[in-house]
């Protein structure tokens, strides 16, 4: 509450997160033209990345393009990309939607369709839908431990969200345990009124707000965090503005002296931890 | 504008960026003692990295040291590093400029020069100039989509820079389209009075400032972002303070039972998105 | 100092860091059942990661689990994990502490102990103590250059911590050189009253606070940074809240057509650069 006689100071904050959980992933894997059921286990080293700062990312879905190599090939026949003759293909042209540079030739993509030939990582990425349901949908049960150290330098006051009295096997609950800083990912979504299973398909951004409203006067001292949650990406976003949250990364390797890569389009939830508040003192 | 009767509150912000573009890179590649022209395509997975927070990085240039292995070799003969006898080399010494630990011996680096032998990743990195012009100079034509969600918790007000009415094929222009949040990298530099082609060689840091001056009173409501751009690194910086922006990273692999790495010194532009402003309400 | 007649504005800041140093690491390496002394050199590309924003990480210790492959194996026999019959193992169960999913069978881990069989990256990670002393304890002698560009947009004022008159071979010292922005990591710890050698074992988080108290009035202009240091992680933290600072990451590769990984549990110091302060002008 506003105490107008107090000198207010904004919070200086540092955050450290630790995600826990294992996901069991079942998907169709094609090898040597044969499609079979693949089963694998993902642990933290597989689905999250060493990150700094006030964000962490949990991969919930992916599309892989394996064994890509730099060469010439027909581009992917997405809407408006097909051709019937070389006239439709412009040498040196880079279509922002495409993944390569056109050679000027129109070549067969498959038995029925022709597209412009490109110099690219080939075969080019198929623009297929993210798997539904999401491959790592069980990430809903992962937990994250959030450690937050705060400082009001003008008041020379430091504290943290985890107190010595706290129990490391707790789980945050708005009513029953509002000071516990171990959060089940599914609960965060529920609190924000969102459906984890749905968001996991395309990815999204979730805000974890930590609000410190600190009264540092000795006679009425209070300084504990309040947690709240809200979705930060726009779920109603137009296709052209890239809804959800995904990024591409590559694993490079050599085979028969040829540089190859596996391209991974990773969909997932980026959690932004937004710490704010003030410390007031007479 | 300052309305003294209003209660002002600083903005809480979350940013999401998406870079698009392909670069065609032509460079001299030496293999088995033979130098030939190499031609390759770089897409987002090759020139940018999965990053969190209010920054994104676009690689515009690089120097590779391929096939390094942990062994003994002469250090690079940079200024002041040459020797004529073992007396000049001190066993166990780590020169901060060097990349290894001296064995105490002075050995031939090439036909004309001798340097101290070191235990290091060998052959040690050549301290050569960044290629000029920059290898990915065409990154000037890449575009970045910036999504910014802001929140004034005290006023319980949330908005974003992308509105449902916006068109996903726009490009930001200070006069013609100041609300479009898709930016051409070259335009950002032009707006900041900088030369992309020049900065791309050594790298640099560019600030994209998003200023929200929000009047949240219902009778004169206004809350839209204003974009401005300024270079954040010091282009006149002394050599000793490492001008530009670069970092080294490594790709590790095994060959002939020996752990090897390719060291990449990546030069590029780090874009920092600096969101600030206030929400005022009676 | 507080000048009540001034209009105060919070600082907008951008940070760029550059770590320098080499570490010599000696450890026991087991290959083909034979244990021998391993000796290697770590340079910046080995112990730090390309990071954005106001943080950088220096690896000071690690535990490796080499040649893991997705299969079935007994889980690690940590406290409470041993079994004597299949009844103790529940098919499909994922223990958050474990690294896999139980098959329902109780199998021998070694000659004396049995544990539940899991589907996981095998052999599962041994829960052994971080090496003591830390493998990269010599990181104490690494240095970091910190470049900080600040901006007060309302006052249209920009400056940086590195001035043209500064000397790139300086080292920060609270008394003798308080404006030098090259810091020895060991000195940062000493200033914060912490023991680098101790913290290096389990890792930790160290805050580097840069305080700008700027008087922008022309008649008494002053705007230089003040550096201070404090530990941000809780050294007295209960085991259940994961003391120190570590994360796991993996290097993936293929051998005999089988996907394998080396899992690295990296312990280290995350340095958070916390920039704050105000610019005041009449």
């Amino acid at each position: 509450s506003d105490k107008l006689y107090q000198r207010k100071e904004p919070v200086i904050s540092s955050v450290h997160t630790k995600v826990k959980g294992i996901a069991e992933v079942t998907e169709n894997v094609t090898e040597g033209g044969v499609t079979k059921l693949g089963h694998s286990i993902f642990d933290t080293a597989d689905y999250t990345f060493p990150l700094q700062g006030n964000s962490f990312f949990v991969m919930t879905n992916y599309v892989k393009s394996e064994g890509q190599v730099q060469t010439l090939c027909p581009e992917y026949p997405r809407r408006g990309a097909q051709c019937s003759s070389d006239r439709r293909c412009k040498k040196g042209w880079m279509d922002p939607q495409s993944k390569g540079i056109q050679t000027g030739r129109c070549v067969p993509y498959d038995k029925t369709r022709k597209t412009c030939e490109v110099s690219a990582w080939c075969p080019t990425e198929e623009e297929k839908e993210a798997p539904r349901p999401a491959l790592l949908r069980s990430a809903e049960n992962f937990t994250v431990l959030i450690k937050n150290n705060i400082h009001f330098p003008g008041h020379n006051y430091t504290t943290r969200n985890i107190l010595p009295t706290m129990n490391g096997s707790c789980t945050f609950h708005k009513t029953w345990d509002p000071q516990c800083s171990i959060f089940r990912l599914g609960d965060i979504f529920q609190e924000a009124g969102e459906n984890f299973t749905e968001v996991a398909v395309q990815g999204g951004i979730m805000g974890i707000e930590i609000y410190w409203d600190c009264n540092l006067d000795s006679w009425s001292h209070h300084c504990r965090p309040r947690y709240s949650f809200r979705r930060l990406d726009d779920k109603n976003m137009d296709e052209s503005f890239v809804p959800g949250y995904n990024f591409r990364y590559a694993k490079y390797y050599k085979e028969n002296n040829v540089e190859k890569r596996t391209l991974i389009k990773a969909f997932g939830i980026r959690f932004d931890i937004l710490v704010f508040g003030t410390g007031g003192k007479f | 504008s300052d309305k003294l009767y209003q209660r002002k509150e600083p903005v809480i912000s979350s940013v999401h960026t998406k870079v698009k573009g392909i670069a065609e890179v032509t460079e001299n590649v030496t293999e088995g003692g033979v130098t030939k022209l190499g031609h390759s395509i770089f897409d987002t997975a090759d020139y940018t990295f999965p990053l969190q927070g209010n920054s994104f990085f676009v690689m515009t240039n690089y120097v590779k040291s391929e096939g390094q292995v942990q062994t003994l070799c002469p250090e690079y003969p940079r200024r002041g590093a040459q020797c004529s006898s073992d007396r000049r080399c001190k066993k166990g010494w780590m020169d901060p400029q060097s990349k290894g630990i001296q064995t105490g011996r002075c050995v031939p680096y090439d036909k004309t020069r001798k340097t101290c032998e070191v235990s290091a990743w060998c052959p040690t990195e050549e301290e050569k100039e960044a290629p000029r012009p920059a290898l990915l100079r065409s990154a000037e034509n890449f575009t970045v989509l910036i999504k910014n969600n802001i929140h004034f918790p005290g006023h319980n007000y949330t908005t974003r820079n992308i509105l449902p009415t916006m068109n996903g094929s726009c490009t930001f222009h200070k006069t013609w389209d100041p609300q479009c949040s898709i930016f051409r990298l070259g335009d950002i530099f032009q707006e900041a009075g900088e030369n992309f082609t020049e900065v791309a060689v050594q790298g640099g840091i560019m600030g994209i400032e998003i200023y929200w001056d929000c009047n949240l009173d219902s009778w004169s409501h206004h809350c839209r972002p204003r974009y401005s751009f300024r270079r954040l690194d010091d282009k006149n910086m002394d050599e000793s303070f490492v001008p530009g922006y670069n970092f080294r990273y490594a790709k590790y692999y095994k060959e002939n039972n020996v752990e090897k790495r390719t060291l990449i010194k990546a030069f590029g532009i780090r874009f920092d998105i600096l969101v600030f402003g206030t929400g005022g309400k009676f | 100092s507080d000048k009540l007649y001034q209009r105060k504005e919070p600082v907008i800041s951008s940070v760029h860091t550059k770590v320098k140093g080499i570490a010599e690491v000696t450890e026991n390496v087991t290959e083909g059942g034979v244990t021998k002394l391993g000796h290697s050199i770590f340079d910046t590309a080995d112990y730090t990661f390309p990071l954005q924003g106001n943080s950088f990480f220096v690896m000071t210790n690690y535990v490796k689990s080499e040649g893991q492959v997705q299969t079935l194996c007994p889980e690690y026999p940590r406290r409470g994990a041993q079994c004597s019959s299949d009844r103790r193992c529940k098919k499909g169960w994922m223990d958050p502490q474990s690294k896999g999913i139980q098959t329902g069978r109780c199998v021998p881990y070694d000659k004396t102990r049995k544990t539940c069989e899991v589907s996981a990256w095998c052999p599962t990670e041994e829960e052994k103590e971080a090496p003591r002393p830390a493998l990269l304890r010599s990181a104490e002698n690494f240095t970091v250059l910190i470049k900080n560009n600040i901006h007060f947009p309302g006052h249209n004022y920009t400056t940086r911590n590195i001035l043209p008159t500064m000397n790139g071979s300086c080292t920060f010292h609270k008394t003798w050189d308080p404006q030098c922005s090259i810091f020895r990591l060991g000195d940062i710890f000493q200033e914060a009253g912490e023991n680098f050698t101790e913290v290096a074992v389990q890792g930790g988080i160290m805050g580097i606070e840069i305080y700008w108290d700027c008087n922008l009035d022309s008649w008494s202009h002053h705007c230089r940074p003040r550096y201070s240091f404090r530990r941000l992680d809780d050294k007295n933290m209960d085991e259940s809240f994961v003391p120190g600072y570590n994360f796991r990451y993996a290097k993936y590769y293929k051998e005999n057509n089988v996907e394998k990984r080396t899992l690295i549990k990296a312990f280290g110091i995350r340095f958070d650069i916390l920039v704050f302060g105000t610019g005041g002008k009449f």
Partner: nanobody, 120 residues
């Protein structure tokens, strides 16, 4: 005691081939550069070819394209495959290795020479 144990060598006709091998044995930390040198009667010892631990090779102009140096890092062995031999290749061939007994304790080791004679 570290030793370099060689094998190969002998008499061969011009245009023929020979393969030399040389293995480092004993107790040591790491084998770094390995090389083959040769010394013809009345001449100075000269470098034939060398190979780094990372398999980078370097050849004397006189043998380039005819000789191939390689190594096996598991067996700590260096090989010299000599094709298209000429009478002027006749010499005593010496194996060389730069071996670290312990970290940062390097020593140069030479093998006993092996005679290669190429008859015309």
């Amino acid at each position: 005691e570290v030793q370099l144990v060689k094998s190969g060598g002998g008499l061969v006709q011009a245009g023929g081939s020979l393969r030399l091998s040389c293995a480092a044995s004993g107790s040591f930390f790491r084998v770094n550069n390995m090389a083959w040198y040769r010394q013809a009667p009345g001449k100075q010892r000269e470098l034939v070819a060398d190979i780094t631990r990372g398999d980078r090779t370097n050849y004397a102009d006189s043998v380039n394209g005819r000789f191939t140096i390689s190594r096996d890092n598991v067996r700590n062995t260096v090989y010299l495959q000599m094709n298209g031999l000429k009478p002027e290749d006749t010499a005593v061939y010496y194996c060389y290795a730069r071996i670290e007994l312990g970290p940062l304790v390097p020593r140069d080791y030479w093998g006993q020479g092996t005679q290669v004679t190429v008859s015309s």
